[in-house]
């Protein structure tokens, strides 16, 4: 009886393992074993597949052919028993376009209101991805163990750090790696649980900002008690996104050691040109807070996006506001020669809530405000480049009093 | 590992435009800093400049600009051009990595330019 | 630019002994100041960075000190791979600009 050759060849390529997968022809016929060969593109002779050489199931691994990923490749099968098959030929494919990223590993830290994720490519030092190591953006799930309401988290890297949780909580989460560039989405890791800690005495410090005078930073920074002392770090942003870099490593900035205030200077010229990150720490001498969220700082925009500076003007019902060119030291005005967007926040100063307004323009009314009432201000500029799309810290918040009654003309 | 070779000539008549190269292996230049750093035959250190992460290059302001540092990161490999040298460029020529302030973490060995006429 | 002045510019010890090199600059730097070491023929090596954090891999009987204009370096119990050059380098300001060396020899 002559052998029927396999049918429905799948190709399965996940990081550096490749599987076949095939349907035999004749179920009826015991003892059969089948075999690969494969050719490269412009190449007319056929090679044995090694590791596919006489199976008797239906999968077999060729991870161990080194093949280069980018280059198409064909594939064909027979059946054998005392005689064989005719071949049968699967459709040339390119292993890198055909791979998927498999799951990626992930590790978790806990702290009281946060969790540290670590995540690494799950095949290490991958052939596949040789090329794209370094452009694995990762996106996860998660959610408290008790409620399983989802969280979506997308475009992070191989650092992550999700803050405002909640302490002694078990959290879920699920990792999953993509390369934008390739247009691939990988495939989820294990679910991982975490417990955060018992809540910490001391909360980490909050609204960290940077500002500019004269040829200085100025780090500021919110705390909720006194007679503390801080310490802020620095890290190159770049070593956020590369896997497994063991130059990872905060460093201090020696004018912001042990400072006793909510703030502390340093010059900018320290800092090469670039995009940093920037964490504080409070310690009482006893204990220590978790670091602060961390935030961005970019020297370059840093540098010339100061606050801006206003004049209000009060009515009954309503203030003008004239927004001017920030001031730098020696009272000068800074030309900033790119358009502003201005984001003017305002509220009572009896209450916390907020009102927000965006404007182009340089003169803003602030409408539907009561009389007799103090209300306060602040206002940031933000770039309208898009590929800029940075904002300058809050000015100093300024507080006017509405005028009586009937005085809005 | 971060490793850092630098490469040139060796010899040079002044006048002459030459490059030198600092080839980097271990870690990709579209990451950090990579800086050029000469030492005189007295001994003395000095600080060129350095090319960034992505492209933007900074020099030392006390030096005259006949030099000028760039990179090509399909080679992760970073260059500094001397223009018309002077016997004054005689020096060992190191490039180095920083993070981000201005100290340098990982070295090449040096390679010696000599100009001469 | 800022200055760094260092002392001495030689110096000849022994093995085991402790020996101590300085760096003035000629205006305060904040503790913004690497000190590293070279081998005759090898590159500078980064010893000390904010003028007191040990560099990864740098043995503990390094220990760098100072504040303001002042600094030292101080290696406690020296070894034979210890000997060769010194350099001082501050980074609190643009350019950045290094010590003159100080040259440390077996006695």
């Known amino acids: 009886k002559n052998l029927k050759s396999p049918q429905k060849v799948e190709v399965d390529i996940i990081d550096d393992n490749f599987i076949l997968r095939w349907n035999r022809s004749d179920e009826s016929v015991g003892n059969v074993t089948f075999s690969f060969d494969y050719q490269k593109t412009g190449m007319d002779n056929w090679i044995k597949l090694s590791g596919c050489q006489n199976i008797t199931s239906t999968k077999c691994n060729f991870s161990s052919l080194k093949l280069n990923v980018y280059e198409e490749i064909k594939l064909r099968i027979r059946a054998e028993k005392e005689n064989t098959s005719s071949w049968y030929e699967v459709d040339s494919f390119t292993p890198f376009r055909k791979a998927q990223i498999g799951p990626p590993e992930v590790h978790l830290e806990a702290e009281d209101k946060a969790i540290v994720i670590h995540i690494s490519p799950g095949t290490k030092d991958s052939v596949m991805w040789a090329l794209d190591g370094l452009s694995f953006t990762y996106s996860l799930v998660i959610w408290k163990n008790s409620s399983g309401v989802e969280e979506r988290i997308e475009n992070i890297y191989s650092r992550h750090k999700i803050y405002k949780l909640s302490p002694e909580t078990t959290y879920c989460l699920k990792v999953k790696a993509a390369l934008l560039t390739s247009w691939k989405i990988g495939v989820y890791s294990p679910v991982h649980c975490i417990k955060t800690t018992v809540e910490n005495e001391l909360p980490p410090p909050e609204n960290i900002e940077v500002s500019v005078q004269n040829q200085n930073y100025v780090l500021k920074w919110d705390y909720t008690y006194a007679n503390m002392t801080f310490q802020v770090q620095w890290l190159h942003a770049f070593l956020k996104r590369n896997p497994g870099n063991h130059l990872y490593k905060w460093k201090q900035i020696p004018d912001c050691e042990n400072v006793k205030t909510t703030q502390c200077v340093f010059p900018q010229n320290v800092f090469q040109k670039g995009i940093y990150l920037l964490r504080v720490q409070a310690s009482d001498g006893n204990n220590t807070s978790f670091w602060s969220e961390e935030i961005k700082f970019d020297t370059e925009i840093q540098a010339f996006l100061l606050p801006p500076v206003f004049n209000i003007r009060s009515l009954s019902d309503s203030f003008h506001i004239y927004i001017g060119a920030p001031k730098q030291s020696g009272n000068t005005p800074v030309i900033q020669d790119y358009p502003l967007i201005y984001e003017i926040i305002f509220w009572e100063n009896t209450s916390n809530a907020e009102r927000k307004i965006i404007e182009k323009k340089t003169d803003v009314t602030v409408p539907n405000l009561k009389p007799l009432t103090v209300y306060c201000v602040k206002a940031r500029a933000h770039t309208m480049d898009e590929k800029l799309n940075k904002s300058s810290v809050f000015s100093d918040a300024v507080c006017e009093k509405t005028k009586p009654g009937n005085t809005s003309k | 590992e971060v490793q850092l070779q630098e490469s040139g000539p060796g010899l040079a008549k002044p006048s002459q435009t030459l490059s030198l190269t600092c080839s980097v292996t271990g870690y990709s230049i579209t990451s950090d800093y990579w800086n050029w750093i000469r030492k005189f035959p007295g001994n003395k250190l000095e600080y060129m400049g350095y090319?960034?992460?992505?492209?933007?290059?900074d020099y030392n302001p006390s030096l005259k600009s006949r030099f000028s540092i760039t990179r090509d990161t399909s080679k992760n490999q970073f260059y500094l051009q001397l223009n018309s040298v002077t016997t004054e460029d005689t020096a060992t020529y190191y490039c180095?990595?920083?993070?981000?302030?201005?100290?340098?973490?990982?070295w090449g060995q040096g390679t010696t330019l000599t100009v001469s006429s | 630019d800022i200055q760094m002045t260092q002392s001495p510019a030689s110096l000849s010890a022994s093995v085991g002994e402790t020996v101590s090199i300085t760096c003035r600059a000629s205006?305060?730097?904040?503790?913004?100041l690497a000190w590293y070491h070279q081998k005759q023929g090898k590159s500078p090596q980064l010893l000390v960075y904010n003028a007191k954090t040990l560099a990864d891999g740098v043995p503990s009987r390094f220990s760098g000190s100072g504040s303001g204009t002042q600094y030292s370096l101080k290696i406690n119990s020296l070894q034979p791979e210890d000997f060769g050059s010194y350099y001082c380098?501050?980074?609190?300001?643009?350019?950045?600009?290094f010590g003159s060396g100080t040259k440390l020899e077996i006695k």
């Open positions: 090319i960034s992460y992505s492209g933007n290059t």
């Open positions: 380098q501050h980074f609190w300001s643009t350019p950045p600009t």
């Open positions: 205006g305060n730097i904040h503790n913004y």
């Open positions: 180095a990595r920083s993070e981000g302030m201005y100290f340098f973490d990982y």
